[in-house]
């Protein structure tokens, strides 16, 4: 047993059908020594006396909120709450396997440049009595500063007969060095607990490797006279690391017909414009990654080429 | 919101077997754990067994270790209850429950109900 915060206990339950479970000692906290009594949550049958409870802690039913009394005044609240192992894991009930980029995918995060600012996501399936913590360090050993707001609800979508939530938050590293070479990864810590379940969920990382930039800006076509070519302009993201001529891009141009089973055009460049022929009713997209590392691209941006 | 309905229940004699059903709709039916509880006239209402989502764990109250069976199908939406070696003191009315918690043997634990399906094992 650990203390998640004050009042909150962590029981870690080895669960297996006729486990004996464990053995857990609360203790009031008063002075008073005689006379007090204890129940569990809302229910006004009493559990033991004394200053001390023992219980067995075996499944949810044994989880809540014990409450310590003395002649119907509350002396102390200890909420329980059960982390459970099967089969030697720990369970992942409350988030779902995002499954990308491989299985037990539950913590995703990208970063749109080098300054040490990134973003985690991850998805529910549940909708009430829902907490969420979140802890960030550079390294594990000696860990350095990570500071991370709250996760907040930032999305809702439906699949099939399923509501589906998507969960977010910001982490910027305190003494992040964008030019630096990582040697440490970042770790990320997500503490859920819904109801009288808790679970903890990690995601370890080189900001380089969750580097996802923004799409180019200001995507312009310039016709070129007498001919169906034309010049694709853009820009950099604003959120990009500068400067550009050491945090480089490099783009890839996309000219797609109307019909997604037309051949597609592309053209790689480094540069921010690139001649291409324009065909009718078709788009011209442009996306960016990182020139000197392979992490992912951005998404497109597009203009079509009327 | 999840609906949910039993089936399966009726008159046996003592050491029949009957099979209840619990049909849920109007949810995703493999997102919840399942509970069987029964409740006598004048009685509490008490826990009977539970099965976890994937249906691969399931957890018992003692007087039906042994007799009674829980299983799910989770491409039918629905979880059943096999009872077996039937006593007198079986008689109940039958609920099952859907919750996020497993194992857990307190119906406020539960928070999707049937309306039940009434047993009765005579002698």
């Known amino acids: 047993i650990w203390e998640l915060k004050k009042d909150v206990y962590v029981v870690e339950l080895d669960w297996y059908p006729d486990a004996p479970g464990e053995m857990v000692v609360l203790t009031c906290d008063t002075p008073e020594e005689d006379g007090i009594t204890w129940t569990l949550d809302q229910s006004s049958e009493v559990l033991g006396s004394g200053k001390t409870l023992t219980i067995q802690v075996k499944e949810f039913g044994d989880a809540g909120q014990y409450t310590c009394h003395k002649g119907g005044e509350v002396l102390s609240h200890s909420l329980l709450l059960l982390h459970k192992k099967e089969d030697g894991i720990w369970s992942t009930d409350i988030l779902k396997d995002q499954k990308e980029p491989k299985n037990k995918t539950f913590l995703r995060c990208e970063a749109k440049n080098y300054s040490g600012r990134f973003t985690c996501w991850w998805l529910t399936t549940i909708s009430t009595d829902l907490t969420f913590s979140v802890k960030s360090s550079r390294g594990s050993s000696d860990p350095q500063g990570v500071t991370c707001g709250a996760a907040t609800l930032s999305a809702e979508r439906v699949r099939g007969d399923n509501k589906e939530y998507e969960y977010s938050v910001e982490c910027q590293e305190d003494s992040a060095c964008p030019a630096a070479e990582e040697s440490l990864p970042i770790e990320v810590m997500v503490d859920a607990v819904h109801k009288l379940k808790y679970e903890n969920y990690t995601s370890s990382f080189f900001i380089r490797d969750i580097i996802k930039p923004d799409p180019p800006k200001n995507l312009q076509l310039k016709p070129l006279k007498n001919s169906r070519q034309v010049e694709v302009s853009w820009e950099y993201p604003d959120t990009w690391s500068t400067p550009h001529s050491y945090f480089s891009l490099t783009f890839c141009v996309q000219v797609q017909g109307k019909s997604k089973r037309e051949k597609k055009d592309r053209v790689f460049t480094d540069k921010t414009s690139a001649t291409v022929i324009c065909r009718k009713n078709a788009s011209i997209s442009v996306r960016a990654q990182d020139r000197y590392y392979s992490s992912s691209w951005s998404e497109w941006a597009s203009v079509p080429c009327s | 919101e999840v609906q949910l309905v039993e089936s399966g229940g009726g008159v046996v004699q003592a050491g029949e077997s009957l099979r209840l059903s619990c049909a849920a709709s109007?949810?995703?039916?493999?997102?919840?754990?399942m509970g069987w509880f029964r409740q006598a006239p004048g009685t509490e209402r008490e826990f009977v067994g539970t099965i976890n989502r994937r249906g691969s764990s399931t957890y018992y109250e003692d007087s039906v270790k042994g007799r009674f069976t829980i299983s799910r199908d989770n491409a039918k939406n629905t979880v059943y209850l096999q009872m077996s070696s039937l006593k007198p003191e079986d008689t109940a009315n039958y609920y099952c429950?859907?919750?996020?918690?497993?194992?857990?043997?307190?119906?406020?634990?539960?928070?999707?109900w049937g309306q039940g399906t009434q047993v009765t094992v005579s002698s």
């Open positions: 429950a859907a919750g996020w918690l497993y194992p857990s043997s307190r119906s406020r634990d539960y928070d999707y």
């Open positions: 109007g949810g995703s039916f493999s997102n919840y754990e």
